[in-house]
Every structure is written in C-alpha cells, then in structure tokens.
C-alpha cells in the first residue's frame, strides 16, 4: 500500500475548491485539524473538512445525483414526449378528415341531407376524439346516435320528401323504428365493431406513451436518501478532505455505489422491459380493423353503403313505416336495445385500404424500434451513470471512500464500510413511494396492453370469425376492401400529401354543428410526412 | 306531447335515503341520454348526473358521486336516481332533463317540471 | 368541477341589444366541447335556446344567437323584448363529460 501523499499543510487547495461550491471561507479549516465531529468523511488523521463541509458536499453529491440522473434520461424522455404529441396531433388529423370525408360524401351524394347530417357527422366525430382523448364514451352509444339521428332525415328527406316538416312525432317515431326495424342491416354493428376495436386500440397506445412519460419524470425527480448521499458525498468529496483534489473514484466501487443508491429505481427495470414488449405487441397489431386510421378514413363508405341499404329496400319501409308512425302520436315511442347479429359478408367489411409508405403504423415501428434500444434503460442506470461521471480507468490509483489505492478490491471496500453503514441495509429498505406507485402504474398498463394485444389476445377475433368475416380480409384484390360504390368516389394517392390535397378549400369544416372544430394547421404537412394511400370521397 | 315527470321529493334527514323517479312519455326514450340537475333556493343550475342511452356511461358531479346512483329502464321509459347519505346542501328542486343526444351529456332539450328534495332535522 | 363564469346582471332596453359572456378553461369550453344556452323564468324549468355553440332549436326566435372563440363562448340577444327579461345560463361539459354550468346571469328589460 502506498503512503499517502502529504497532506496539503495550509488546506489551501481545499479552500480554493470549496470556494466555487460555496462563496466564502468560513467553515474550511486553514490547516488540518482532527475533524472528530465528522461523520461522513471519517479522518485517517488530520483533515481539512468541517462538519458544515460535509454537509455542503452531501447536498452537492445529491444535486449531482439528480442530475446525472435527468441527463441520463434525457434523450428516451424526449423521444415518448416527442412521439405522444405527434401521435395525439396525428389521430386528431385522422379524425378531422374523416369527418371531411363523411361530410363531403354527404355533400356530393346527399346534398339534400347536408345540413343536418354535417351536424350529426359533427358530433359523432367530436365524440371520437373525445373517447381517444380519454372520455369515458361507450362506442355503441356514439354509433347508435348516428344512425338515430340519420334515420329520420333520410326517411323524410330522401324516401318520403312529400312529409310535412312539423312532423317532430314522426321523427320520434322513426328513431324507434330505426332500430326495431334494422333499416340500416347489419351496418351499424359492422361500425361499432370496426371503430370500437381500432378507437380502444388507439386510446391504450396514447395511454401507454403518456404513462411514459410519467414513468420517467418520476424517476428524473427523485430525492435521493440521506443513506445515499452519504455513499456519494464519501464517493466524490472525502477524497477533497485529505488534499487529494485530482483523484477519482474507482469504477467498481462507483458501481457498488450506484447500485445502492438505485435500487428502488432498478426495481422497475422488469416492468419497464414488459411495457416496451407489450407495447410492441400492441403496434404489431394495429393494421386493418385495429387501425383508426384504416377505420376512420373508411367510415364515409360504410354509412354511404348503409345509406344506399336503406334505400335498396325503401318500398318495403316505406310501407312498414307508414303503418308504424301513421298515428305517431299514439304510439308508445319504445325500442329496444337490439343487438344485431345478422350475418356480415366479408365484402361488407369496407376499410379503406393502406399503402403503406410513410404511414401512421411505419411511425408506430419506427417508435418501437428506437424504444426498444432503450429496454435496458433502468438496470443500466447504474453503469451509465458512473460511465458519465469521473471514474479512474482499469480501477488503478484510484479512490475507494477511504484512501487511494493501486487496485480496488469491492471485499476491502465493503468491509471498511461496515463501520459507517450497511450498503446492504439501503438495497433491502425497497422502492421509494413513488416508485411504487409507478411500477403499479406499469402493472396496470401492461396487463391492458396484454389484453389489447392481437391476435391471441383479441376475444372480439373470435367473435368476427363466427359471424362470417375475418378482420380486414380482403384477398389479394384490394378492391374487395375498399370502400366507394357510389358516385363521387375516387382514390387519392399518398395519404400524406392526403392532408395537403384534402380539400381545405372544402367548406364542410364550416357547417352548422362543426363550428368547435379546430382548422388545419400549416404544420400539419410536415407533422408526420406521408400517411399512405386512402379512398377519398373527393371529387 | 314529449313529458318528463319527476317524483318522489319530500323532506328527508340529513344521512337517509330517497329515490327520485322521473317518466318520460312522447320520445324514443331509449336512444337518448338522460340528465338530473339541481337548483338549490335562490341559486343558480348544478348538473347532478347523467346516463346514456344504453344505460353503460354514468357520469356523476364531484359532490355527488359516490352518494347518488342514476339508473334507467329503457322497457319502462323511467329514469331514477338514488341518493344516499343525504346532506344539507342536497336540498334542492331536482330536474329531469332529457338530452338532445344518445352518448352522453350535451344539451338538455326537454325538462320536467321539478321535484322539491328538503333535506332537515 | 368548476363553474364556468358569467356575469351577475345584463339589462338593456327594449329594442336594444345585450351580450352575455361565458368565460371556461381549455377542458371544457375550450376543448372539442359544445356550449347550449338556456333561459330560465323565476319558479319554472329552464328552457333551451341555443345548442352545439350557434344552433337554435326550433321555435327559438333568431333574434337568440351563440358563438364561441377559445375559452369564451356569448349568447347575444338582438331586439330585446319585455318577455327577454329572465335567467340565462350557459352550459357545457369538460373532458371527463361531466357537464357544468355557468352561475346564471339575470337579464332586465329596463
């Protein structure tokens, strides 16, 4: 073992650097004094730190900590910020453009519905931005609304125009019969099951990225114990004490140090690690019926489709309902709440169909991918936080909390701790309450996303292939898939020049009903390139 | 003629029960949500709860919730709402109001005409 | 949930035009959500005048009319009339979809 080198007999180096820690030389020493009332820095024999020292250093070792610890987490905080807020802009993009879509399908093929539909249009996807935004909004509810409200405006607008407008019974009547009558077939039930699936899919993946970033806040801002700031104060600034300003802590024992430090915060690597697989899980099933982008930007075909259903069968209603709501006023205005269970033919399953370029899913992988290279992030943090700090090299001439040493020995190490404090007794003492309730965070998100998760996962699946479809089940023709019999139906290629081209010039944003909705931004273009290839109902 | 009519106000004390009710004549009862809302003596409107259509969303004001419990039966066109634990500050006139909408709470077309709830020792 | 606010009292005289304001925050009236206005006389049930921020039910008269910009939203009434003279209150529901009111603004005809 080398003698120690000579102690600075002045403390002069010691006062020069703890000056710039805090202005003004009261507390240090001016030469080596016994230091008897130390209690971090514990004395092999005179010292130039004071007991006020000491606790400058360990408040200083803890501001350190803490921020070593943000700097770690700088670049994965950034990257789930980053993404949660082009996703959210992204589906409320979606969502605008369905609703121009639904609107302008109205507008070319419905005008005479226009004024009332748009409203109805409105409200339903003012309600789809809610439910992905979090609102507690039952879908079949939201669809059920539509149709409802559509039904008697396509009854006395289209198939009945000689009515009377005063007919408010009737329309009562009709919103009845809607339902009691299946006028829209199987359509409405084919909605709920398309939106329901792709809307609960894309409200869990916003849900799992801004838990996120909730996890890593809580870890960026977490007080370090007493405990710890006692290991890194004796880590970085003991070594100060005995004038020793240019050695460095030696790399195993950094690690030791961290490792104690961080045990309640490793304590989440294992759910850290299930969230990003599970989120994988997730976005490896987002295509098809599991992708609002799909589904939304499909939906104006499905209601233009239930609306010619309607109107294929009109003579027969048309008498059904004239002997239903001829006396409106006295009938008991009473319908059930029906399930529909007639068989879906796979070509009713009309989901517009992706190209996939630089869509929403390529950026959902994209995500992934970078997410996944951060999996380690949590049992790393002990490392990659001694790796950013001042270590010695090959752990040679170094400082091991006591004394400098030619090679650190982690038993030497331990059993000079002993006498100070258990490191062992600081791993055992478990997470810090935040922690916890973090981690119980994550449980709950991942067994959601593991419940999400397609295809086993998926229990609605089953249901699908019992009523005669597959999700998203096209063949190799994709016009099987897509939506767009009728007139005013044309396909736009690239979706994301899809948000220059769709039309803002088309006044539908401006109808009565839409009036909260926000207007495209500019930045909308560059949000997130090029979504792909959508069925437009753009003339 | 589109009616809703409430019942089952009274005086009650403070902690104990009722149960309002309120029968909707004249519409689909069943394809829109359905609201209660209070006017306390002299003040202004509080929304109470709200239920949609289907009966699976509830929606319930702060200070109610956990107390009061609002339910349907769309085969008897009637909406309810229990409340329990009464207070002082429950007293008030209770509305039904029926909703322009299916899915959840949004504006409130049609009211009945108010049953007063007195909450005393 | 908070109440949205509007002010106490509004008056004008017949014929006159009066504005009320409502004034909520970004998760409610500010956010996806829509804004009815109601009217209310002393010892009867409110009734509905405006909904979905601008639209009238029918037989609302037109001189009744709603906008709404960011957190505010306004209910204007052109051409006031004796029968005007009543309790207003705006509504909307935040993002939770719980509904909340405004306190109420008495109009007087003077």
């Known amino acids: 073992q080398p003698p120690p080198p000579p102690p600075d007999a002045t403390c002069h180096q010691v006062r020069s650097f703890f000056q710039r820690l805090q202005p003004g030389l009261k507390w240090v020493p001016e030469t080596p004094v016994p230091g008897s009332d130390l209690q971090v820095c514990l004395p092999k024999g005179p010292t130039c730190c004071s007991r006020k020292m000491e606790e400058k250093y360990q408040l200083t070792a803890r501001l350190n900590m803490e921020q070593l610890l943000q700097s770690a987490s700088m670049e994965l905080k950034f990257l789930i910020i980053q993404n949660a807020a082009v996703f959210q802009e992204a589906f409320e993009i979606v969502v605008r453009h369905a609703k121009n879509y639904t609107n302008a399908m109205f507008k070319n093929n419905y005008p005479s519905l226009t004024p009332q539909a748009f409203e109805f249009v409105g409200e339903f996807f003012t309600d789809v931005s809610l439910y992905i935004l979090g609102s507690d909004i039952n879908v079949d509810d939201m669809v059920n609304e539509l149709f409802d409200s559509l039904f008697p405006v396509i009854y006395t607008q289209l198939m009945n125009p000689g009515l009377p407008d005063s007919a408010l019974d009737i329309n009562e009547c009709l919103r009845g019969a809607r339902r009691d009558l299946k006028v829209f077939g199987n359509f409405p039930k084919l909605i709920m099951t398309q939106v329901s699936k792709s809307l609960q899919v894309t409200r869990i993946f916003l849900q799992a990225l801004n838990l996120g970033i909730e996890v890593i806040n809580t870890t960026d801002h977490l007080k370090f114990s007493k405990d710890c700031g006692r290991m890194l104060t004796r880590m970085w600034y003991c070594s100060y004490c005995q004038g020793l300003m240019m050695v460095k802590p030696c790399g195993g024992y950094c690690n030791v140090v961290m490792q104690g430090c961080m045990a309640g915060v490793v304590e989440i690597d294992k759910y850290w690690r299930e969230y990003i697989l599970s989120l994988e899980e997730l976005v490896n099933g987002m295509y098809r019926i599991y992708d609002m982008e799909n589904v939304l930007l499909g939906l104006f075909s499905t209601i233009h489709d239930s609306i010619q259903y309607v109107q294929k069968n009109a003579g027969k209603l048309t008498t059904t309902i004239g002997k239903l709501c001829a006396h409106s006023q006295q009938r008991q205005y009473r319908s059930a709440y029906y399930p529909e269970d007639l068989f879906i033919d796979k070509k009713v399953l009309k989901v517009a169909h992706v190209e996939h370029e630089e869509t929403l899913s390529s950026r959902r992988r994209e995500l992934i991918q970078k997410l996944k290279s951060f999996i380690s992030f949590y049992s790393a943090l002990p490392g990659y936080i001694c790796s950013h700090s001042p270590v010695a090299e090959n752990d040679t001439l170094c400082w091991n909390g006591q004394e400098l040493v030619e090679r650190y020995s982690q038993k030497a190490a331990r059993n000079g701790m002993k006498n100070q404090f258990n490191l062992h007794e600081l791993k055992m003492k478990g997470p810090e309450p935040v922690v916890s309730q973090i981690i119980d965070k994550l449980k709950h998100i991942n067994q959601l996303l593991r419940t999400m998760s397609m295809p086993k996962g998926r229990v609605l699946d089953k249901n699908l292939d019992e009523e005669g479809f597959e999700s998203g089940d096209c063949g190799d023709d994709e016009d099987e898939c897509i939506g767009g019999s009728g007139d005013g139906m044309i396909k736009v290629k690239n979706q994301l020049r899809f948000l220059a081209e769709l039309a803002y010039d088309l006044d539908v944003d401006d109808a009565p009903g839409n009036s909260q909705q926000a207007t495209p931004k500019d930045n909308e273009i560059s949000t997130f390139h090029n979504l792909g290839n959508v069925h437009s109902p753009l003339k | 003629q589109v009616q809703l009519q409430e019942s089952g106000g009274g005086l009650v004390q403070p902690g104990r029960s009722l149960r309002l009710s309120c029968a909707a004549s004249?519409?689909?009862?069943?394809?829109?949500?359905m609201n209660w809302v209070r006017q306390a003596p002299g003040k202004g409107l509080e929304w109470v709860s709200a239920?949609?259509?289907?009966?699976?969303?509830?929606y319930y004001a702060d200070s109610v919730k956990g107390r009061f419990t609002i339910s349907r039966d769309n085969s008897k066109n009637t909406l309810y709402l229990q409340m329990n634990s009464l207070r002082a500050e429950d007293t008030a006139v209770y509305y039904c109001?029926?909703?322009?909408?299916?899915?959840?709470?949004?504006?409130?077309?049609?009211w009945g005409q108010g049953t007063l709830v007195t909450v005393s020792s | 949930q908070s109440a949205l606010t509007q002010p106490p009292s509004a008056s004008g005289s017949p014929g006159q035009s009066v504005t009320i304001s409502c004034t909520g925050t970004?998760?409610?009236?500010?956010?996806?959500?829509?804004v009815s206005w109601y009217q209310q006389y002393p010892g009867k049930a409110p009734k509905l005048l405006i909904y979905?921020?601008?639209n009238r039910p029918s037989g609302v008269p037109d001189r009744f009319s709603g906008s709404k910009s960011g957190t505010s939203a306004s209910l204007a009434i052109t051409g006031l009339q004796a029968e005007d003279g009543a309790d207003y209150y705006c509504?909307?529901?935040?993002?939770?979809?719980?509904?909340?009111f405004g306190g109420g603004t008495k109009v007087t005809v003077l």
């Open positions: 979905g921020n601008s």
């Open positions: 004249g519409f689909t009862f069943s394809t829109y949500a």
């Open positions: 109001a029926k909703d322009r909408r299916g899915s959840h709470a949004d504006a409130f077309d049609v």
């Open positions: 239920i949609s259509m289907s009966g699976e969303s509830t």
């Open positions: 509504q909307s529901y935040d993002s939770s979809l719980r509904v909340v």
């Open positions: 970004s998760s409610d009236v500010g956010g996806y959500n829509y």
